[in-house]
């Protein structure tokens, strides 16, 4: 049902990385506009992206209020130029999104190796603690602030001269690994939330190798 020549949105999809969260849908509008509503299970629906011809809506500001809640969004379709018009049920045509729980489902963004420092046969590798759009007391929280010990990093490292990879894990943002003296190593890290069932791992960080700018070498 619905207003003549108005079609319901479909393929509603959440796109979320490090809590930056956008709802996307189809189709591209022809003689219609969309308004999005989002709610937790409280049913207190909040309207966003009023009468837009876009097929996406940034809902980050809403979901960061409580990333552990489960959200539902719905996209209403209205005839262009006649947004008061409703369907035969007295309501505009709409479609619901899948449920979305940011804490459990937001994709982990590609991490970045902030620095590495060699002291003798030890190398300290530090992962950048990326800022999110989640706020507490008017300050933006980092990924570690939000996830705490639920978030671990896996370090992959190998001698520049060989392909055999080793791994290390940490529930902080730092690794301290043993290396062979006089050898150059390359590093890549991956963010992981082991307790998750979906979106458990990020993509690997860009590779960083010793002997390049990010590193510092100190012979003891």
């Amino acid at each position: 049902s619905g207003t003549t020549n108005t079609v319901a949105a479909y393929n509603l999809t959440w796109k979320s990385t490090n809590f930056k969260t956008i709802l996307e849908w189809e189709p591209k509008p022809v003689n219609q506009v969309y308004t999005v509503q989002i709610s937790t299970k409280s049913g207190d629906w909040k309207s966003k992206c009023f009468y837009t011809t876009d097929t996406e809506c940034d809902l980050t500001d809403e979901i960061v209020k409580d990333v552990k809640q489960t959200y539902l969004a719905r996209v209403f379709s209205y005839p262009a130029g006649n947004v008061e018009s409703t369907g035969s049920a007295g309501e505009p045509l709409y479609e619901n999104s899948p449920e979305f729980t940011p804490y459990l489902e937001t994709n982990l963004g590609q991490p970045t190796i902030q620095s590495f420092e060699q002291v003798g046969t030890k190398v300290n590798v530090t992962v950048e603690d990326e800022r999110t759009l989640v706020r507490r007391n008017n300050t933006f929280l980092s990924l570690r602030d939000v996830f705490g010990k639920d978030l671990i990093y896996t370090l992959y490292y190998w001698k520049s001269s060989s392909s055999g990879k080793k791994t290390a894990k940490t529930n902080t943002n730092e690794f301290l690994i043993d290396v062979d003296k006089g050898e150059n190593y390359c590093f890549s890290v991956q963010a992981v939330i082991p307790s998750r069932t979906v979106n458990r791992k990020s993509t690997d960080s860009p590779v960083e190798c010793m002997g390049q700018e990010k590193g510092e070498f100190r012979e003891i």
Epitope: T40, G43, D44, W45, E95, N96
Partner: antibody, heavy 118, light 107 residues
């Protein structure tokens, strides 16, 4: 464990009033919309009213609009239904139900019987 | 208002049978449909929401399907505790409405 316990039902004369209560436990009450659904003796289910988690949005069936008022006290985890100008056709078991997104009824109380008769 | 029509109104079946109950909406409701089970003198119990999503704790022999106007509830292998009355409910728009119920009895 989610528990919903209704109270306040009873026998009332036509034109009279009753206030039903529903004490909720086992979940974060203000995170959920809540509803009242009724069932006349030997009949099917009829949605009566719903209220959002904040209490800011309320919805009513046409059959009770203007006579019934749904409300909630989130500090006491309690849902209410104030029923005025009661009629014989309001006789039913009244259930309170947890209502995610204000959509469907995932947990129900055991019900309280309201009888409107002279 | 959206009318919900269930069929059959009553149904006799045996333990182990596969049973299907249908629900038809008077207009399209997408997947905004729930199913409930009610036993005599008891409160209803949620089985399915969003037409096909199984409520937590409900046995997997229950399944729902459909979209638009036609929906089905299927019990793949009837158990003794499944004899009850089943209701569908639309939550596409207010007022929310239920089907008249399907009473599932022992043959």
């Amino acid at each position: 464990e989610v528990q919903l316990l209704e109270s306040g039902g009873g026998l009332v004369q036509p034109g009279g009033s009753l206030r039903l209560s529903c004490a909720a436990s086992g979940f974060t009450f203000n995170n959920y919309a809540m509803s009242w659904v009724r069932q006349a003796p030997g009949k099917g289910l009829e949605w009566v009213s719903s209220i959002s988690g904040s209490g800011g949005r309320t919805y009513y069936a046409d059959s009770v609009k203007g006579r019934f008022t749904i409300s909630r006290d989130n500090s006491k985890n309690t849902l209410f239904l104030q029923m005025n100008s009661l009629r014989a056709e309001d006789t039913a078991v009244y259930y309170c139900a947890k209502t995610p997104w204000g959509y469907y009824f995932d947990y129900w109380g055991q019900g309280t019987l309201v009888t409107v008769s002279s | 208002d959206i009318q919900m029509t269930q069929s059959p109104s009553s149904l006799s079946a045996s333990v182990g049978d596969r049973v299907t109950i249908t629900c038809r909406a008077s207009q399209g409701i997408s997947s905004r449909l729930a199913w409930y089970q009610q036993k005599p003198e008891k409160a209803p119990k949620s089985l399915i929401y969003a037409a096909s999503s199984l409520q937590s704790g409900v046995p997997s022999r229950f399944s729902g399907s459909g979209s638009g106007t036609d929906f089905t509830l299927t019990i793949s292998s009837l158990q003794p505790e499944d004899f009850a009355t089943y209701y569908c409910q639309q939550y596409n728009s207010y007022p929310y409405t239920f089907g008249q119920g399907t009473k599932l009895e022992i043959k």
